[in-house]
Every structure is written in C-alpha cells, then in structure tokens.
C-alpha cells in the first residue's frame, strides 16, 4: 500500500543552468493523495530559507504528480542561487531538497559559455 | 524489478572513440540520476560523473571532464558514456548505477558492466 | 576531493567469526540536511557491485542482519558478526555528500 504522506520529489543537489533574460519555470513536483497541501517556495540565505511573497506561481496536474511551479518572467542575475520548496500538511511541514540556480549574465558575457566554462564554474559551485 | 542492461564488450583502437549504452527496466531514469563507474582490471572503482536525465546536466569528476560524456534519451530509457581519445589506461570495465530514490538519491542498482578494450 | 580510506587492505577470517572494516574520509560526511551519506559495498568474484548499507547504517532489503554499519562524520566502520562463505569479496564504502563522489581503496575478504 503507498504511502499517503506529502513527497516532494526535488531531486538532491539538483541545478539548473539559465540565463537572464530568459523565461523560466522551476517546478516542485509534488505527491499527494486526497487534499492538494498548501505548497510554498523559498529561496535559500545562509542557513535561512527566505519564503518568496507575490510571486507568479501555478499548478500543473499530471498523471500521478502535481508541479507547484515558481515563474520567473524574465530571469534576473539576482534569481542566482538555492531554492527550495515546502509544503503543509497535517500541521507539519515537509521540506524539499534545495535546488540551485545557476544564472549567467549575457549583459556580461559576450556570448554564452561553452560546455567546459559551464563545466567549471558548476563546479566551483558545488565544491 | 529494477534492472539496467549494458551494451556488449567494446574492442577499439587507440585514439578512436567509444558509446556505451546503459538500458533501464522496472523505473523510469528521469526520476532519479544515473551514475557512471569506471574498474580497471584488478583495481578499485572510480566515479566518473552523474547525468540527471530529466533535464540533461550533468557533473564529472574534473578527471573525466575531458574524457567523458554523458547523455540519456527519456523516450528509451537510456543512458549513453562516450569516451574519446582512448589509450590503453581506458581498458577497464565501465558500469552504470542508478541513483537511487527519492529522497536519498544514493547509488542502489548496478548494470552488469561494459569491458572496453583499447589496443591497437 | 574527499580522499577514503579503508583498512585494513586484506581480511582473513575463518566462517563463524567477525570481521571489521574501517572507512575514514578525509572531510565530514554530515551533509547540509543532515544526513550522512556512506555506502558500503560488496563486489563479489566476477560480479558487478551490490549495495550492502545506505546513509551509514541502514541495510538494504536483503541483505542478513549479520552485517551492521556505524560511524558519523569521517569515521565509519562495517561489522560481520559471523562471516559465511558467501561473505569473500571486495568491500567498498563510498561517500555521496561531496563532489566528486569518492570511493574507498576496498578491502579484500578471504576465507581462511
């Protein structure tokens, strides 16, 4: 029998490579069973997770998952960083994995980054 | 049940170029990540890198950064190693594992593993 | 990277005994949400890798209770109560929490 418990299925040290100017969607996938929990997005500070207030967010409904989806319409430098979603359910909440935004700024690049640019500068990222 | 299916021994040339495919079964890769393992014969285990196949990017160990590149195709549950400029301190046995589940995202399920080759 | 390292190299037990293997990592494996993330590993003869036991202690579906995994932060240790022939193989730990992941040297288990 599956369990009926809320899962946000972000994958863990998740990243997403973007640029300003462009749209972009950064979904939570989320599980439930009978009630759509209250779901909401935070951007990481430090060790604080900051809640995100007036922004464009959605539902998207498929077959056997729901995406709670943080619009960024277009993305700025500043949407750099770590963002992680939560969600309320019975009185507690449930926190995804973060997951990083890595924006590159094409004002100040001449043009897009190779591979190996992204490459590198994911990694220092990460380490 | 969770498998993953590797493509067949690989006999190459040094210089030349190698893909080697990974087939799942029993779970769908955009759901997890798929690793990449290298074995050389009588050695240990060397991490490769790792492929989110939802969205494509990837993370190399800067070793393999210029060696290795790693690809999954959605629609046939596959992943894909491509190694270039083979010389012989490639000839190993390559695996691929899965990443295992939400939300630990660990290494769980191993293919049978690619012996690959390289002599001239 | 996070440098493993596993001792001792070789083990040579007799069936019905315990056996220990030692994994130290060169960094903390405590992970920003808390969790450890060290595997143990078993590669028997001929075979491909099996996971033995995830997030440092927790064994996988299967696999006999005889072995346990214990440790936090960069010491870590697989305990086999009471080794059996199918035991003999090359034991890995690996660690998850850093990039790049890293393996252990291994540590070969032979049946006296």
């Known amino acids: 029998k599956e369990s009926c418990d809320v899962q946000l299925y972000i994958k863990r040290q998740s990243y997403h490579s973007i640029f300003a100017g462009d749209p972009f969607k950064l979904e939570c996938p989320v599980k439930y069973c009978a009630h759509r929990p209250q779901v909401t997005w935070c951007k990481l500070n430090g060790t604080t997770c900051v809640k995100l207030e007036g922004r464009h967010t959605s539902w998207k409904q498929e077959k056997n998952l729901s995406f709670f989806i943080l619009h960024f319409e277009p993305v700025l430098p500043s949407d750099n960083g770590s963002y992680r979603c939560s969600a309320n359910f019975l009185s507690a909440i449930i926190e995804s994995h973060s997951t990083t935004l890595y924006v590159t700024d094409v004002k100040s690049a001449s043009e897009r980054p190779s591979k190996d640019e992204m490459a590198s500068r994911l990694w220092l990222l990460y380490s | 049940e969770v498998q993953l299916q590797q493509s067949g021994a690989e006999l190459v040339k040094p210089g030349a170029s190698v893909e080697l495919s990974c087939t799942a079964s029993?779970?769908?890769?955009?759901?997890?990540?798929i690793y990449w393992v290298k074995q050389r014969p009588e050695q240990g285990l060397q991490w490769i890198g790792r492929?989110?196949?939802?969205?494509?990017?990837?993370k190399y160990d800067p070793r393999f950064q210029d060696k290795a590149t790693l690809t999954a195709e959605i629609s046939s549950n596959t992943a894909h190693l491509q190694l270039n400029s083979l010389t012989s301190e490639d000839t190993a046995v390559y695996f691929c594992?899965?990443?295992?589940?939400?939300?630990?995202?660990?290494?769980?399920?191993w293919g049978q593993g690619t012996s690959v080759t390289v002599s001239s | 990277a996070v440098v493993m390292t596993q001792t001792p190299l070789t083990l040579s037990v007799t069936i019905g005994q315990p056996a220990s293997i030692s994994c130290k990592s060169s960094?903390?494996?405590?992970?920003?949400?808390?969790?450890?993330?060290l595997i143990w590993l078993l590669q028997r003869p001929g075979q491909s890798p099996m996971r033995l036991i995830y997030?440092?202690?927790k064994l996988d579906s299967g696999v006999p209770d005889r072995f346990t995994g214990s440790g936090s932060g960069t010491d870590f240790t697989l305990k086999i109560s009471r080794v059996e022939a199918e035991d003999l193989g090359i034991y890995y730990c690996?660690?998850?929490?850093?990039?790049?992941?890293?393996f252990g040297g291994g540590t070969k288990l032979e049946i006296k």
């Open positions: 492929i989110d196949p939802a969205n494509g990017h990837t």
């Open positions: 029993g779970f769908n890769i955009k759901d997890t990540y």
């Open positions: 594992v899965r990443g295992g589940d939400h939300p630990y995202y660990v290494m769980d399920w």
């Open positions: 690996w660690q998850g929490t850093h990039f790049p992941r890293t």
């Open positions: 960094q903390n494996l405590l992970d920003s949400d808390g969790k450890t993330y």
């Open positions: 997030l440092v202690s």
